[in-house]
């Protein structure tokens, strides 16, 4: 009976999400393997988040709006491990917008989800950021490593969206 009611709840939750995400990929987790954590298909998952790489070239603001429509934000990178996971799926000759910007050009960087900007957990390429006119951040491959660079916000780039996993 308990299992039956849990299944019914799950199905109704799945139906609820189906209007936003036609297809979800779920894995069982938790100590009794009773919880399902899901990401929209074909998003990838790492820890408690889902990631989507958009190859559409758009400005930073349009990229953020595009993520927002999908219930996500441009990616906020919190750890080196998270960055290493994300970069496994990126092309080395491309650049991707992050959810990091400095709209006033005062070098006051801010994450789109209001996560405090911690200078000690940043992965800027050497010499970056280097221009107050370049107010948005990308991740790209340079000098044999992935890192961040400040660029002009209005110039179209690819982007990475991030959202919390859906638990059902």
């Amino acid at each position: 009976n308990f299992m039956y009611s849990k299944t019914v709840k799950r199905l109704s939750k799945l139906q609820e999400y189906q209007q936003y995400y036609p297809s979800l990929t779920c894995v069982m987790e938790g100590k009794d393997m009773e919880d399902w954590s899901c990401c929209p298909t074909p998003w990838t998952s790492f820890q408690s988040s889902c990631y989507f790489i958009s190859t559409v070239m758009q400005s930073w603001t349009k990229s953020q709006n595009n993520c927002s429509v999908m219930g996500a934000d441009l990616v906020v990178i919190n750890t080196k491990e998270e960055q290493d996971f994300i970069t496994q799926n990126l092309k080395i000759n491309s650049a991707y917008f992050l959810g990091l910007s400095d709209p006033k050009g005062w070098r006051h960087w801010q994450w789109v989800d209001q996560t405090p900007y911690n200078k000690n957990v940043t992965f800027w390429h050497s010499g970056e950021p280097n221009s107050p006119d370049e107010r948005c951040a990308i991740i790209n491959f340079r000098s044999e490593e992935w890192g961040w660079n400040d660029v002009h916000c209005h110039v179209p780039q690819k982007s990475i969206c991030k959202m919390k996993k859906i638990y059902i």
Epitope: W60, T61, S131, R135, H152, H154
Partner: antibody, heavy 121, light 111 residues
Framework: EVQLVESGGGLVKPGGSLRLSCAAS????????MSWVRQAPGKRLEWVAT????????YYPDSVKGRFTISRDNAKNSLYLQMNSLRAEDTAVYYC??????????????WGQGTTVTVSS | DIVLTQSPASLAVSPGQRATITCRAS??????????MHWYQQKPGQPPKLLIY???NLESGVPARFSGSGSGTDFTLTINPVEANDAANYYC?????????FGGGTKVEIK
């Protein structure tokens, strides 16, 4: 006083080349992004090329990509536009404009008087 | 590309009256309260001159008779009261994404 003075316009045959120059004064040229904007007779303004302050980025619309090259010499306070494979539709007044960044975009706060380019056989 | 449509194409206004020009963008040029629409004045044989930046900010040295408003896709430039030397073409421009684009212009004539 900010001044932008263009030169180098003229009459050229289709397929020909021309190099426009813009001499800047009255401000720290190396600190600003610069653009070329053109205006065909009786038409709207059209952005042609942008170069970032540090010379690290150049941008072009599809209509001129591969034919036009923007460059700058910060030591000489000068902006250039090399125009190759010119077409009749490139006929316009070409303005040099200074960019001022605002939030996620920018605007053109100073413009030169313009130089006329006529492409005709 | 973002297309900017200005209306009217031309208008004739008497000195002391109000002139209103609108600019409609094919998609939003606003983001989190910042509106990346700008206005320029161009007199015959002269380069454009910046009047208003970011929808409503008056450029230094521009008379307070000029004002701008709007957000999203719809923006307005108002001249009130109009003076004889306001006869010119007026253009809107967006810069939220490349390529920066301009409106087709509005010709203001003084009656």
């Amino acid at each position: 006083e900010v001044q932008l003075v263009e030169s180098g316009g003229g009459l050229v045959k289709p397929g020909g080349s021309l190099r426009l120059s813009c001499a800047a004064s009255g401000f720290t040229f190396s600190s600003y992004g610069m653009s070329w904007v053109r205006q065909a007779p009786g038409k709207r303004l059209e952005w042609v090329a942008t170069i970032s302050s540090g010379d690290s980025y150049t941008y072009y619309p599809d209509s001129v990509k591969g034919r036009f090259t923007i460059s700058r010499d910060n030591a000489k306070n000068s902006l250039y536009l090399q125009m190759n494979s010119l077409r009749a539709e490139d006929t316009a007044v070409y303005y040099c404009a200074r960019q001022l960044y605002y939030s996620y975009g920018y605007y053109f706060d100073y413009w030169g008087q313009g130089t006329t380019v006529t492409v005709s056989s | 590309d973002i297309v900017l449509t200005q209306s009217p194409a031309s208008l004739a206004v008497s000195p002391g009256q109000r002139a209103t020009i609108t600019c409609r963008a094919s998609e939003s040029v606003s983001f989190h309260g910042t509106h990346l629409m700008h206005w320029y004045q161009q007199k015959p044989g002269q380069p454009p001159k910046l009047l208003i930046y970011a929808a409503s900010n008056l450029e230094s040295g521009v008379p307070a008779r000029f004002s701008g408003s709007g957000s999203g896709t719809d923006f307005t430039l108002t001249i009130n009261p109009v003076e004889a030397n306001d006869a010119a073409n007026y253009y809107c421009q967006q810069s939220i994404e490349d390529p920066p684009t301009f409106g087709g212009g509005t010709k203001v004539e003084i009656k």
